[in-house]
Interface confidence: low
């Protein structure tokens, strides 16, 4: 192959000028013509100067993978995927996310110590003895209340998840 310059690509034993971002090669340069470049069609892109005969397919952000589109695809840049609300990234691919997972739900008896982010899952914490959380929120675990005076006996011991009344 010939040693082509940065703005050229090899075609047989010669070098042809590359097409710009957003364009692909329709026809290589010839004796009387420069490279014939054609715009990328919707749903395809090329981000750099290139000698490609076809534009690249834009990636799809699959909701089934917990993904949503954070940047639409243009003819010069691929789409970027982010996590849908309530999801965090489990597979990072360069500057975008390839797969997300729904935040963990704190179980009864646990409180949310730290809310989930785009890159981290929800962090749950067990409620200390004598406290409870029924809905697994960021609220502090609640202290169990004493039985009302008209109840003669406790129905059972309180747990961190619920209380007997």
């Amino acid at each position: 192959l010939p040693s082509c310059k940065e703005d050229e690509y090899p075609v047989g034993s010669e070098c042809c000028p590359k097409c710009g971002p957003g364009f692909h090669v329709r026809q290589a340069c010839g004796e009387q013509t420069g490279t014939v470049c054609e715009p990328c069609s919707p749903g395809t892109y090329i981000a750099h100067f290139n000698g490609l005969s076809k534009c690249l397919q834009c990636q799809m952000c699959d909701p089934a993978m917990g993904l949503r589109t954070s940047r639409n695809c243009s003819t010069t840049a691929n789409a970027l995927c982010g996590c849908s609300p309530g999801h965090f990234c489990i597979i990072q691919d360069g500057d975008h996310c390839a797969a997300c997972r729904a935040y963990a739900t704190s179980s009864p008896g646990q409180r949310v110590q730290k809310g989930g982010t785009e890159s981290q899952d929800t962090l749950c914490q067990n409620c200390p003895p004598g406290t409870f959380s029924s809905n697994g929120t960021l609220e502090e675990c609640q202290h169990g209340t004493k039985c009302s005076k008209w109840l003669v006996t406790e129905a059972g011991p309180g747990t961190s998840s619920f209380r007997w009344v």
Epitope: P2, C4, K5, E8, G12, S13, E14, E31, Q32
Partner: antibody
């Protein structure tokens, strides 16, 4: 190997025409274009025209009215004809192959054909 | 048309001397379209440097080419007797193709 062989020298009268045949070997005229360049005595090089692999031609605007370049691919021959000659057309005429290199420089040249225009 | 002006028109160099020939172009051209040819007396021109800086096959590595825009040069790092010849620059950035008037390089 690649060669371009030109027909022999000549002496022509003013207002007459000159004809040169360039016979190529080692490559096909269906793939490569052929340029014509001349060099007047004691002077530099002057591009006259080119015939492309597909048969199209481009001429130097200064000569377009009296220049004709054609070819026979099957015989690997390129034909050059210039009409209405003047003394200033006395020169060595070269055929040269258009190369597939950076910028498409002329990579192989014929040996040249000397033409003198004189009465 | 694009005019190529070479300088000097004639120069003499001693063996081992560094030599630089310049080619000034009347309007900006792409560096890929500027070439140099060597011609010795009674011989056809030979391609010498393609696309500003690419040596043709068989050209000694003491030769180099550089430039961009409207200013180009051919340099011999150490002159040798066999380098004595006339050197022409040529452009194919636009029609018609044009050549410089040549630089005749002689050896002392």
């Amino acid at each position: 190997q690649v060669q371009l062989k030109q027909s022999g020298p000549g002496l022509v009268q003013p207002s007459q025409s000159l004809s040169i045949t360039c016979t190529v070997s080692g490559f096909s005229l269906t793939t490569y274009g052929v340029h014509w360049v001349r060099q007047s005595p004691g002077k530099g090089l002057e591009w006259l025209g080119v015939i492309w692999s597909g048969g199209n031609t481009d001429y130097n605007p200064a000569f377009i009215s009296r220049l004709s370049i054609s070819k026979d691919n099957s015989k690997s021959q390129v034909f050059f004809k210039m009409n209405t000659l003047q003394a200033s057309d006395t020169a060595i005429y070269y055929c040269a192959r258009r190369g597939y290199n950076k910028g498409y420089a002329m990579d192989y040249w014929g040996q040249g054909t000397s033409f003198t225009v004189s009465s | 048309e694009i005019v190529l002006t070479q300088s000097p028109a004639l120069m003499t160099a001693s063996p081992g001397e560094k030599v630089t020939i310049t080619c000034s172009v009347s309007s900006t051209i792409s560096s890929r379209n500027l070439h140099w040819y060597q011609q010795k007396s009674e011989a056809s021109p030979k391609p010498w440097i393609y696309g500003t800086s690419n040596l043709a096959s068989g050209v000694p590595v003491r030769f180099s080419g550089s430039g961009s825009g409207t200013s180009y040069s051919l340099t011999i790092s150490s002159m040798e007797a066999e380098d004595a010849a006339t050197y022409y620059c040529q452009q194919w950035n636009s029609y018609p193709l044009t050549f410089g008037s040549g630089t005749k390089l002689e050896i002392k």
